[in-house]
Amino acid sequence: EEELQVIQPDKSISVAAGESATLHCTVTSLIPVGPIQWFRGAGPGRELIYNQKEGHFPRVTTVSDLTKRNNMDFSIRISNITPADAGTYYCVKFRKGSPDDVEFKSGAGTELSVRAKPSAPVVSGPAARATPQHTVSFTCESHGFSPRDITLKWFKNGNELSDFQTNVDPAGDSVSYSIHSTAKVVLTREDVHSQVICEVAHVTLQGDPLRGTANLSETIRVPPTLEVTQQPVRAENQVNVTCQVRKFYPQRLQLTWLENGNVSRTETASTLTENKDGTYNWMSWLLVNVSAHRDDVKLTCQVEHDGQPAVSKSHDLKVSAHPKEQGSNTAPGPALASAAPL
């Protein structure tokens, strides 16, 4: 009679985490009499997975009814697979012996690899805002995937970025892995509406990559440009001076008018107009009663934007340039009259 062979037809199988793994094993003969055992690994450190004869193996079920007299199928199913279950599984035939059964023949082994999906990528930007032309770093992290092979790409508004560094940890063997990538992005004034996207592709995702995003609106600070202009005379002895605050982001802005270096009025930006690029404009104006001044007046519009050092723009108001109109019956007003923004 031909000697018994233990056949494990699958050299390797791959199973998604959470699913069941079926490990196939058949024997070619009913002789010698004795049980089958399944082990993970080989040698003295191997781990018993299933013993036909005895023991409690809650995650393991047999595919066939082993109590049937002529059964030669000793395949097993392991439920709820996790990455920790990866390894090489051996189906081993034992010969009945006294006092102990004796190992008779082993199958060639089936390598079980476990596929685990990466977590949704989390993108984080710098702690502090930065201004256009500056380079900022974004990080992307994803965890818990297996196998180790993974692809990560960075995009800004759909355009792929090339300046990034990626590490997959650990470098050695592990039940699951993590990826960490840092991308460098140069900010432009138009980036308020921009998005940075980290895209992760893995065998478990079946061609549908995971994405994590960061809005550059959380990262960018666009400083305002200031323009102070003198409007034509509105009424007798009064000049309208406006401070146009343009193209700034975020909204947080405080404006102070100074008259010859002395604080005249402070106001906080409200009723802003939004530009197409996401930046804001604002305007503040003053009515100046020139009749109250003997000398020229230096008017300064000082803006503190988003907690940054103040920027300012000045305008010299020439008193001589506004002669008093004859026959005026308007009583002289205060030197400076505040006005709501237009």
């Epitope: 690994g41 003295p44 450190g45 191997r46 781990e47 081993v92 082993s106 063997d173």
Partner: antibody, heavy 122, light 112 residues
Framework: QVQLQESGPGLVKPSETLSLTCTVS????????WSWIRQPPGKGLEWIGF???????FYQSSLKSRVTISLDTSKNQFSLKMTSVTAADTAVYYC????????????????WGQGTTVTVSS | DIVMTQSPLSLPVTPGEPASISCRSS???????????LDWYLQRPGQSPQLLIY???SRASGVPDRFSGSGSGTDFTLKISRVEAEDVGVFYC?????????FGQGTKVEIK
């Protein structure tokens, strides 16, 4: 191709602890046993012990009380710690990979480090 | 522990001639599966040991076919069909059936 590299101090004082690390490059830790073997000057090979990739350890009975072998799969490294050393522990220490294909035994120590000389002296 | 005994302990050889080394184990290395857990190693001067034969008779990767292993149970032989100058060094047999792994005392092969 797999390479092993031992690292650690070449001189240890008597009664102190000998610590060696072996870094595995170019291959996986999984499915192998990772062994420490030593060779005293002018003598033969003495097996100290090994660790399986699943963390199970086996030691030479005469050294068991003094020896610990540990594995850091994340770094692809395994380590040997031997306490209370004496001059008799002076040797070339090799780290090595032992294959296991099936069954209860092993299939040869197929990859060896270049060895590191450890001298126990005050 | 399984005790491994080699003979001879020293073997002067002539290049081109055959050579053989014996190894005896204190208990059978033939496992119930029919596998023999006996290995042969060569340690060249100043180098680490290298695996020549495993499983009693299987040549390790890259080992020249002039090396062959035979034997079963407790008696084993390593044969070199034609010795070459690079074969000088110490040959060790080792058992891998059970822990502790044990080695023979070594056979020093040198050119006559």
């Amino acid at each position: 191709q797999v390479q092993l590299q031992e690292s650690g101090p070449g001189l240890v004082k008597p009664s102190e602890t000998l610590s060696l690390t072996c870094t595995v490059s170019g291959g996986s830790i999984r499915d192998y046993y990772w062994s420490w073997i030593r060779q005293p000057p002018g003598k033969g090979l003495e097996w100290i012990g090994f660790i399986y990739y699943n963390g199970r350890t086996f030691y030479q009975s005469s050294l068991k009380s003094r020896v610990t072998i540990s594995l850091d799969t994340s770094k692809n490294q395994f380590s040997l710690k031997m306490t209370s050393v004496t001059a008799a522990d002076t040797a070339v220490y090799y780290c090595a990979r032992v294959r296991a294909y099936s069954g209860i035994g092993l299939d040869g120590t197929d990859v060896w480090g270049q060895g590191t000389t450890v001298t126990v002296s005050s | 522990d399984i005790v491994m005994t080699q003979s001879p302990l020293s073997l002067p050889v002539t290049p081109g001639e055959p050579a053989s080394i014996s190894c005896r184990s204190s208990q059978s290395l033939l496992y119930s599966t029919g596998y023999t857990y006996l290995d042969w190693y060569l340690q060249r001067p100043g180098q680490s040991p290298q695996l020549l034969i495993y499983g009693g008779s299987s040549r390790a990767s890259g080992v020249p076919d002039r090396f062959s292993g035979s034997g079963s149970g407790t008696d084993f032989t390593l044969k070199i069909s034609r010795v070459e100058a690079e074969d000088v060094g110490v040959f060790y047999c080792g058992q891998a059936l059970q822990t502790p792994l044990t080695f023979g005392q070594g056979t020093k092969v040198e050119i006559k």
